[in-house]
Interface confidence: low
């Protein structure tokens, strides 16, 4: 399997809220013996390997915001601790998953990491990840609502998150 | 810096227990899983166990299976293992290594000097 | 149970040669889940290749990994002194994981 990233950048003002997504792409085991984890994290462009370094958001580790369940299966983070932080990750039964930031700030801007970790049962993990940037901007040259960046084209899309 | 710190070693005769501990700092423990790796004195490295990072799952090489049994205190930042019914072959030097697996198993990504464990009678 | 076998058990080399080491699994490792270590005596295994051909953090170019499936290989482009070591190969995938038995690089 893959993990997709629709948009490799997204653009917001400052106190506007953004769902950043990933999209689980291939055949997906559904056996009993088979977990999949989903999470987010913050990180930087490690000179080796994007995503190598796991940072939390807004103090929730990797571990806070993850989703745990089988196969295309829904599910939500723990709803106290995230909404605390402004954050709430979630999965639906097609393979996408997101986390939602409210009241961005300019400490949130920096780079994101989906995660998605198959674990079979007496074997290894596997993992993927997605890689997408977060700029927060104030000031005049804000934009008004956010302005997301296809990773596969340079053509920018203007959504209210 | 990552530092995993063994202890707990030292001469056991057959048959008797030993719990051996392993002390982490510098990373967040309850985030990784651990594992213990032994080296018989002159030999190759063998896989013992591994722990999970929340102590979900463990699993054991067939030669420890029933005998030895891998526990951590994330409160503590602490791996351990009970060694139980030990045997003149369970002589070696024991590590512990982090994984380097967000949650289950992958490689190990750092070690401790080792504790030397000797069954003798 | 995946059984490694390095060869060879040991390579006499001296310091500016290349070194190959070989390490053959017994049945496929997926997703190409080994591992090299570095040992000296007394000391612990150092990781060196994950996924069979990725260097570790803070290890030098020198050394690189490959292969797939059943076959893996660490190279040394250029030996340096404090590359005289055992080296192990190591399999992630599947419990139980299992190591090589060593390959013992000497000076010559």
């Known amino acids: 399997f893959k993990v997709a990233t629709p948009y490799s950048l997204y653009v917001c003002p400052e106190g506007q809220n953004v769902t950043l997504t990933c999209r689980l792409l291939g055949p997906v085991d559904k056996g009993h013996d088979v977990t999949f984890y989903k999470t987010w994290y913050r990180s930087s462009r490690g000179e080796v390997q994007t995503c190598s370094e796991r940072r939390p958001i807004r103090n929730l580790t990797f571990q806070d915001l993850h989703l745990h369940h089988g196969g295309h299966q829904a599910a939500n983070t723990s709803h106290d601790l995230a909404q605390r932080h402004g954050l709430e990750s979630a999965s639906d039964h097609h393979g996408n998953f997101s986390i939602t930031m409210r009241n961005l700030t300019l400490l949130d801007s920096g780079l994101y990491c989906c995660l998605v970790v198959e674990i079979r049962h007496h074997h290894s993990e596997h993992r993927v990840h997605g890689a997408m940037e977060l700029q927060v901007q104030t000031g005049k040259d804000a934009p008004s609502n956010c302005v997301v960046y296809p990773s596969s084209s340079q053509d920018s899309e203007n959504i209210t998150a | 810096q990552v530092q995993l710190v063994e202890s707990g070693g030292g001469v056991v005769q057959p048959g008797r227990s030993l719990r051996l501990s392993c002390a982490a700092s510098g990373f967040t423990f309850s985030s990784y899983a651990m594992h213990w790796v032994r080296q018989a004195p002159g030999k190759g490295l063998e896989w013992v166990a591994i722990?999970?990072?929340?102590?979900?799952?463990?699993y054991y090489a067939d030669s420890v299976k029933g005998r030895f049994t891998i526990s951590r205190d994330n409160s503590k930042n602490t791996l351990y293992l009970q060694m139980n019914s030990l045997r003149a072959e369970d002589t070696a030097v024991y590590y512990c290594?982090?994984?380097?697996?967000?949650?289950?198993?992958?490689?190990?990504?750092?070690w401790g000097q080792g504790t030397l464990v000797t069954v003798s009678s | 149970e995946i059984v490694l076998t390095q060869s060879p058990a040991t390579l006499s080399l001296s310091p500016g040669e290349r070194a190959t080491l070989s390490c053959r699994a017994s049945?496929?490792?997926?997703?190409?889940?080994l591992a090299w270590y570095q040992q000296k005596p007394g000391q612990a295994p150092r990781l060196l290749i994950y996924?069979?051909?990725n260097r570790a953090t803070g290890i030098p170019a020198r050394f690189s990994g490959s292969g797939s499936g059943t076959d893996f290989t660490l190279t040394i482009s250029s030996l340096e002194p404090e590359d005289f070591a055992t080296y192990y190969c190591?399999?992630?995938?599947?419990?139980?994981?299992?190591f090589g038995q060593g390959t013992k690089l000497e000076i010559k």
């Open positions: 722990i999970w990072y929340d102590g979900s799952n463990k």
């Open positions: 049945q496929s490792v997926s997703s190409s889940y």
């Open positions: 996924d069979a051909s």
């Open positions: 190591q399999q992630y995938n599947s419990y139980p994981y299992t």
């Open positions: 290594a982090r994984d380097s697996g967000f949650y289950s198993s992958y490689y190990f990504d750092y």
